[in-house]
Structures are given as C-alpha cells and as structure tokens.
C-alpha cells in the first residue's frame, strides 16, 4: 500500500487517520528533501492531483483541507517541486479511512444446527461502519461462571465440545472499531432449546389418479429429535400467496403428505421444521416443483426436477440415498 513507500518527509491527518464520515479534515505534508527548498507542494488523492483548498503554511509544509469528507477509503500522497528537478519528488503517503462507530449489536441469536457440532451466534450489526470493526462474543456459563471470549469480524461458530460449563449460558456481543465501542444486551440460552433439526428435504411427489386425484409429497429429515413440528407451504407457480399446512412429525419414517390440487397446474412446495415448542425454525427447503397431470398419474423426484414429468403407473419407491445433514440458511 501507499504506507510502504520510502518517505522524504512526513504526512499526517487531523483529527486522525481514521475519522467519522462527514467530518472536515486537514492533511498536512512536510517536506524533508536534501538540497531542496520546495517551490510548490502538491497533494494527490487516489492518484489524482488536488487543485483547491491547499494552503502553504511555511517553506516546508502545506495543508490540504476537505469539507464533509464522505469517502470510506482514500490513498493520499504529497510531492514537492524542487528547483533543478524535472519531475516532482515524492514526500510521503498515507491511507485514510472514514466511517462510523459501531451501533449497539442487537437481535443476538445463537442456534445449534443439528449435526454441525457448532453453536452459531449471529446478530444485527446495525448500520455499515465502513471501517474495520471487530466483535467480541462473550459466552458465560451460568453454572460455572466461567467466561470465554471469541473475536470475529461477523458471526461466530463455537464448537459445542468447547461448551463444557453445562447447558445454560449468557451470550453478549461487544462491537469495537477505531471510532467507538458498544455492547449488546445479554442473551440467556439453554443448549437444549436452540437446536434446529437437520434439514427437511422433499424427495418426490406423485399424483394418484383416483376419483378425486390426490398428490402425495414424500419428505424426510435425518434428525434425531423425536418431537418435531413442520410446515409445508405450496402454491401454484402463477400465484403470489402460499397455502400452509402444519404437521406434528415423527421422522422415524419418511413422511407422506396428501394434497388435493387442481389438475394440469405447476405447483411449488417447500418445507421447514423446528423442535416442537422451541423458538427457531429451519430455513425453508429448496423449491420443489410438481406439475399435476390432466388425468394420468405421475411421479416427480429430485432426479426429474427440470420441469419434466413421468406418465404411466405410479412408482413405488425412488431411492433417496443419504440426506445431507448440514443444510443451513437464515433462521425463520
């Protein structure tokens, strides 16, 4: 960067190299070049020479003034015009940054995605700071009172193996940068209450041509949680609004859910689950499309998801193989 150059003088910023966005700032340049009494001192921002707001303070020093500086980052350097020198001589350079102090982190959330082996903590960091902002996540056992701290730039994954202080913890987040520091409220968690079940996946669909045709959606999860509540939402692809069906689910077997749908329409399905009575939902599963036939029974499986469908007899089973256990996304 610009800060690595060999200097023949000094450049500095007032009030500081990192300052609050929108401030008025002064950049000073002082030459210390052998056998050179500078005729003129020049300032460059991101390689472009500045023409205005430059004041000569004395024989070796000049000041560049900016009003309401709004750029997050800029590389500044200054040069001197020396007598008997054809080119300008570089004096020194500096990277400057403007931004904001951090907001108070809020909406601190910690979840354990089943099979991840981690507790994932996230928070709303507030407005963009534009400058390097670090977060310290504090995890304090309510049983042993032992506190662990984790430094991060965004969210944090904490191995559940490192949570040796029982099941109950306080979690809070400190945000800090060059312009300030803020601390969130404390979140109390119980490890058993924050588990999000392994992702539910729709594996196939079939429409059975009975007197009233019905569509069966097959879906499953590898969860080891015995009491799970799920929602399946579905709509015609041409519609805006979703229909939602709720289920108390027992994943000791692959689930089969029945729907009475309009013929010859393309539908989209998604499913999500949570441990019954707990707070956090899985993200919605990926979109699963199924076009109902006019009259002929049909099966749609993951293998046939490119808007194709089978006519003929309904298929008794389609192998699903392993379900992925680490699918994750936003918390519902």
């Amino acid at each position: 960067g610009i800060t690595n150059i060999n200097c023949s003088g000094h450049i500095w910023v007032e009030p500081a190299t990192i300052f609050k966005m929108g401030m008025n700032i002064s950049i000073y340049c002082q030459a210390a070049i052998k056998n050179c009494q500078p005729r003129k001192l020049h300032f460059y921002k991101n390689g472009i020479k500045e023409r205005f707001q430059i004041t000569r303070i004395n024989k070796t020093t000049a000041r560049l003034w900016y009003k309401n500086f709004l750029e997050p980052h800029a590389s500044m350097y200054c040069t001197a015009e020396c007598p008997k020198h054809f080119q300008e001589t570089l004096i020194c350079g500096k990277d400057i940054s403007s931004g904001y102090p951090p907001d108070i982190p809020d909406e601190v959330t910690c979840v354990i995605y089943e099979y991840s082996g981690n507790m994932t903590c996230t928070w709303n960091a507030g407005k963009l700071t534009y400058i390097d902002t670090k977060y310290v996540v504090h995890v304090k056992s309510l049983e042993t009172e032992e506190e662990q701290q984790y430094l991060t730039s965004s969210y944090i994954n904490i191995s559940t193996d490192s949570l040796q202080g029982g099941k109950k913890y306080l979690v809070w987040v400190q945000a800090a940068n060059a312009l300030g520091m803020e601390e969130s409220k404390q979140l109390q968690i119980h490890l058993d209450d924050i588990v999000i079940p392994s992702a539910a996946v729709i594996s196939r669909a079939e429409t059975i041509n009975a007197t009233v045709p019905k569509t069966i959606i097959y879906w499953d999860s590898q969860t080891t949680i015995e009491k799970v509540s799920c929602e399946m939402r579905y709509k015609a692809t041409t519609n805006q609004t979703w229909n939602v069906k709720e289920f108390d689910t027992n994943f000791t077997y692959v689930q089969q859910s029945e729907f009475y749908l309009e013929p010859n329409i393309k539908y989209v399905f998604q499913v999500r689950c949570q441990e019954t009575g707990k707070r956090y939902w899985q993200p919605w599963s990926s979109l699963f499309f199924h076009k109902t036939p006019e009259t002929v029974p049909q099966v749609t499986s993951k293998a046939f998801q490119h808007d194709t469908w089978n006519s003929g007899l309904t298929v008794a089973s389609i192998s699903t193989g392993h379900l992925t256990s680490d699918n994750r996304g936003d918390i519902g």
Epitope: E114, Y115, S116, G117, T160, D161, D192, S198, D220, S221, Q222, T223, T224, E226, N250, F251, T252, Y253, V254, Q256, A316, S317, L323, S325
Partner: antibody, heavy 118, light 107 residues
Framework: DVQLQESGPDLVKPSQSLSLTCTVT?????????WHWIRQFPGNKLEWMGY???????NYNPSLKSRISITRDTSKNQFFLQLNSVTTEDTATYYC???????????WGQGTSVTVSS | DIVMTQSHKFMSTSVGDRVSITCKAS??????VAWYQQKPGQSPKLLIY???YRYTGVPDRFTGSGSGTDFTFTISSVQAEDLAVYFC?????????FGSGTKLEMK
C-alpha cells in the same frame, strides 16, 4: 467413511459385569446421531440394548434397564457398554452401531463375541 | 414391545430367481421398517429403511414395500452373493425390535 470397532473381554464369569468399548473413527460422537449397542445370540436372534445420543442422553431397552449403562469418553471418541450381573444367557456377539437419523442402523462394528461361563 | 415376525426361517432359491421375504409387525408401524443382510462372520448391513427406501449404494435389485403391519423385501434377480440371512427391524419406536431372520439358500 465412519468406522466402529468393539473391544473387550472374550470371557466373563457369571454375576460379574461385562464392559465393552466402541471406538469410533472419522466422525465425532458429539456431533450427531444415536450410538447403539445391539447383541446377537447364538441362533441369530438380534436384540437392541440401548443408545447414547450425541448430546449424552441415553435410552435403554426396558428388559435390561436395571442392569445396563451406556456412557462415553468424548476425548477418545468412544462409547461404552456396561452390563451388570451377567448370566450365561448374556453370551452373544455384541455390536456397536450408528443410527441413520431416527431410522435404521447404517454403520456397524464387526462385533465382539462374549461368552459368559465359569 | 412390537413383535416382528418373519414366518420363513429358510427360503430356497436359484440364481436369477425372484424371491420375496415377508415380515409382519404386531402393531401398526406406518412405514418404519428396515431390512438388513447378514453374511456369515459379518455384521448386518443396511439395505432398506422406511419400508421402501434403498440405502446408499444398495443395488436396485433389492426393493422393499408395505405399510402398517405387512412388509415385503424382494430380490428381483438373485445373485450368488445374495445368499445370506435377511432381517427386518421396526424403527417406529424404542425398544427397537428385529425379526428372527430368513436364511436364503440355494436349491
């Protein structure tokens, strides 16, 4: 791939305790799944004995509840079976296994044969 | 406890035959039934779970069907390496229980 390996004594005297170890490689037993003990008697009959969940909670076959304990050592990635007050009826091949979600057992150890005899 | 009954202790077959093994649960287990293959000196190997779902890597000549209390495991074209004991198991709830096994042997 996940591997499970049982180890323990071949011979146990009646009224004593039977202790077996299952060592799991390539998957942390604290990360997920239920970890089971199943035994197979001479003549092929299989009996589910119990499991330890990745969180550490346990579930035992009621027919063995007064005699069985399943524990674990997370630092060694091992889980253990202790069966107290054994009789000759406990002579069997003992398997440890991992459960596929809440469904079937997808990974099994190769089994260890235990004879109860004086 | 849920009792799983495999009525045939032995079944005779020839290479290329289609063979079906049945298993009956003493109460409704929806589709929570698995099938295992066990060869001499080996541990059981999972073939089918949830009545009809082939486990990863299992050849498609092996299929399962049924729901409620009656379940069937079928090998569409028996290979020599399929000679083994086949067990059903209910995974509907604990205590998990197994059938007594059906030994597939050559005629």
């Amino acid at each position: 791939d996940v591997q499970l390996q049982e180890s323990g004594p071949d011979l146990v005297k009646p009224s004593q305790s039977l202790s077996l170890t299952c060592t799991v490689t390539d998957y942390s037993i604290t990360r997920g799944y239920n970890w089971h003990w199943i035994r197979q008697f001479p003549g092929n009959k299989l009996e589910w004995m119990g499991y330890i969940h990745y969180s550490g909670s346990t579930n035992y076959n009621p027919s063995l509840k007064s005699r069985i304990s399943i524990t674990r050592d997370t630092s060694k990635n091992q889980f253990f079976l202790q069966l107290n007050s054994v009789t000759t009826e406990d002579t069997a091949t003992y398997y440890c296994a991992r459960q596929y979600g809440l469904k079937a057992m997808d990974y099994w150890g190769q089994g260890t044969s235990v004879t109860v005899s004086s | 406890d849920i009792v799983m009954t495999q009525s045939h202790k032995f079944m005779s077959t020839s290479v290329g035959d289609r063979v079906s093994i049945t298993c009956k649960a003493s109460q409704d287990v929806i589709t929570a039934v698995a099938w295992y293959q066990q060869k001499p000196g080996q541990s059981p190997k999972l073939l089918i779970y949830s009545a009809s779902y082939r486990y990863t890597g299992v050849p498609d000549r092996f299929t399962g069907s049924g729901s409620g209390t009656d379940f069937t495991f079928t090998i569409s074209s028996v290979q020599a390496e399929d000679l083994a004991v086949y067990f059903c198991q209910q995974h509907f709830g604990t205590p998990y229980t197994f059938g007594s096994g059906t030994k597939l042997e050559m005629k």
